[in-house]
């Protein structure tokens, strides 16, 4: 029986958002933790592990041409990672040798509960997000943004760090989750797939999105990120789902028009300063909301979720700039660059407006079969 | 309390070779992509070239094949192997550490090429 669709309103104009529905009618549910339909074959969404992708989907090689303080985690796993004796409980850095986060890759060895013991830990991201069991909280205010129109100068830094494009941003991007839940904007990076394949992180009734973008706040109760790590709280992430639109979108296109300049993994280049929050739906007042953890390595957790209900548009040709420009490790295309869905072990996702309520005219009733649980604290 | 302390710089002649250090404390340097950056008389700091976490590396077009950028991680050491230099390498060197969403950079060390 299919799950009701999010509830349906005509998208807010402006910006460069997109559908406020995010799902097709073709879209299935699926059930927590089982393979989706759009995953790489073979992956199994078990805990702490990443996509592994069948032969046909392995990236490209590339042509051979001339030529990554004391971190605090807490939430560590209790389970064991296969093949491994049991790690220490309270320090995802054992020592220097022993828990190297510099070698983790997508698909494939090391396992990432081995690169870090935390991406073996119960409260992982990225996650299923099933809207009929999501809890409305009204206490879940619009989100604030403040500062992210930037100037031209000075310019930003957009680097191809062999796992993504990744954007710095400057001091003085503050986001607020509600009052006394204050976090500044560092940096924003995007996960995608391959031609014809989705590549978002979080999947919607096991729906995955063709790309997803990150937008990685600080508490403004902490100095730095690894002072920051695995408190609860202590990082924010604002995302949101990428899909394929009739129109360029012109936010977007001052990034990836400058892709080829980055083609090459550890290459940067310098890029205007832009509206940070066009790159963003333009409604921030419906969304999802649960507590996670980092999708890569160090997989801390304590993470703040926010997961726009309203998508972004992209051209076709966008999209396909944007998983068919940059190379990664060992001479291969950075693709696929997602890890797989997470269980949910018990957590709830949050709703800052009715999701569970389907719009049709067949919904008598509505039913929400989770209730808030702390919202807003 | 991060810190990066460079050195290595000084006075070399056209053609010469300098190897310039980049020795991280506070930080857990191994996850950490590690660049240098320069800046020379008269214009803003550039990028000279960056090793990710994972080793790969990358030079930008002006010194690919004169320079080579490397790392140890078990000495939480950047170095930058600087061949064949020309007057217009001369600059200030700086150490970049990015990781997520910190970032954290060097006082620098000059670089003079000069007969």
């Known amino acids: 029986q299919r799950l009701p669709r999010m509830q349906e309103d005509s998208p807010l104009g402006g910006g460069s958002s997109g559908e406020d529905d995010p799902l097709g009618e073709e879209d299935l549910p699926s059930e927590e933790d089982s393979p989706r339909e759009e995953d790489p074959p073979g992956e199994e969404d078990l805990p702490g592990e990443e996509d592994l992708p069948g032969e046909e989907d392995l990236p490209e090689v590339k042509p051979k041409s001339e030529e990554e303080g004391s971190l605090k985690l807490e939430d560590l796993p209790t389970v064991e990672a296969p093949g491994d004796p049991q790690e220490p409980q309270n320090n995802a850095h054992r020592d220097k040798e022993g828990d190297d986060q510099s070698h983790w890759r997508y698909g494939g060895d090391p396992p990432w509960p081995r690169v870090s013991p935390a991406c073996a830990g119960r409260f992982q991201s990225p996650v299923d997000i099933r809207p009929q069991l999501a809890a409305f909280c009204p206490a879940l205010r619009p989100l604030e943004l403040l500062g992210f129109q930037l100037p031209p100068l000075p310019e930003l830094r957009l680097r191809n760090n062999g796992h993504s494009v990744q954007l710095t941003l400057p001091p003085g991007l503050e986001m607020a989750l509600g009052p006394g839940r204050e976090y500044r904007a560092l940096q924003l990076h995007l996960h995608w797939g391959a031609a014809g394949r989705p590549g978002s992180e979080h999947t919607v009734e096991g729906h995955r999105f063709p790309a997803e973008i990150h937008v990685v706040h600080l508490s403004t109760a902490f100095a730095r990120v690894d002072e920051a790590l695995g408190r609860p709280g202590g990082l924010a992430v604002l995302a949101a789902f990428l899909e394929e639109g009739p129109e360029e979108n012109s936010a977007y296109e001052q990034l990836l028009s400058r892709l080829e300049e980055i083609a090459e993994e550890g290459s940067e280049t310098q890029v205007p300063g832009l509206d940070i929050s066009a790159l963003l739906p333009s409604d921030f007042s419906r969304y999802f909301q649960y507590e996670g953890s980092l999708t890569t390595p160090p997989c801390a957790q304590g993470v703040i979720w926010t997961v726009f209900n309203q998508t972004v548009m992209l051209s076709a040709k966008q999209l396909h700039t944007l998983s068919d420009t940059l190379w990664g490790p060992g001479d291969s295309r950075l693709q696929l660059n997602f890890r797989a869905t997470q269980p949910l072990n018990g957590r709830v996702i949050e709703a800052s407006f009715p999701a569970g309520v389907d719009s049709s005219p067949r919904a008598a009733e509505p039913v929400q079969l989770n209730s808030c649980l702390a919202a807003g604290d | 309390q991060v810190q990066l302390v460079e050195s290595g710089g000084g006075l070399v002649q056209p053609g010469g070779s300098l190897r310039l250090s980049c020795t991280a404390s506070?930080?857990?340097?191994?996850?950490?992509?590690m660049g240098w950056y320069r800046q020379t008389p008269g214009k803003q700091r550039e990028f000279v070239a960056r090793?990710?976490?994972?080793?790969?590396?990358y030079l930008t077009d002006s010194v690919k094949g004169r320079f080579t950028i490397s790392r140890d991680n078990s000495k939480n050491t950047l170095y930058l192997q600087m061949n064949s230099l020309r007057a217009e390498d001369t600059g200030v060197y700086y150490c970049?550490?990015?990781?997520?969403?910190?970032?954290?950079w060097g006082q620098g060390t000059l670089v003079t090429v000069s007969s």
């Open positions: 970049n550490a990015a990781w997520i969403g910190d970032d954290y």
């Open positions: 090793i990710t976490a994972g080793g790969g590396t």
């Open positions: 506070g930080i857990i340097f191994s996850v950490y992509d």
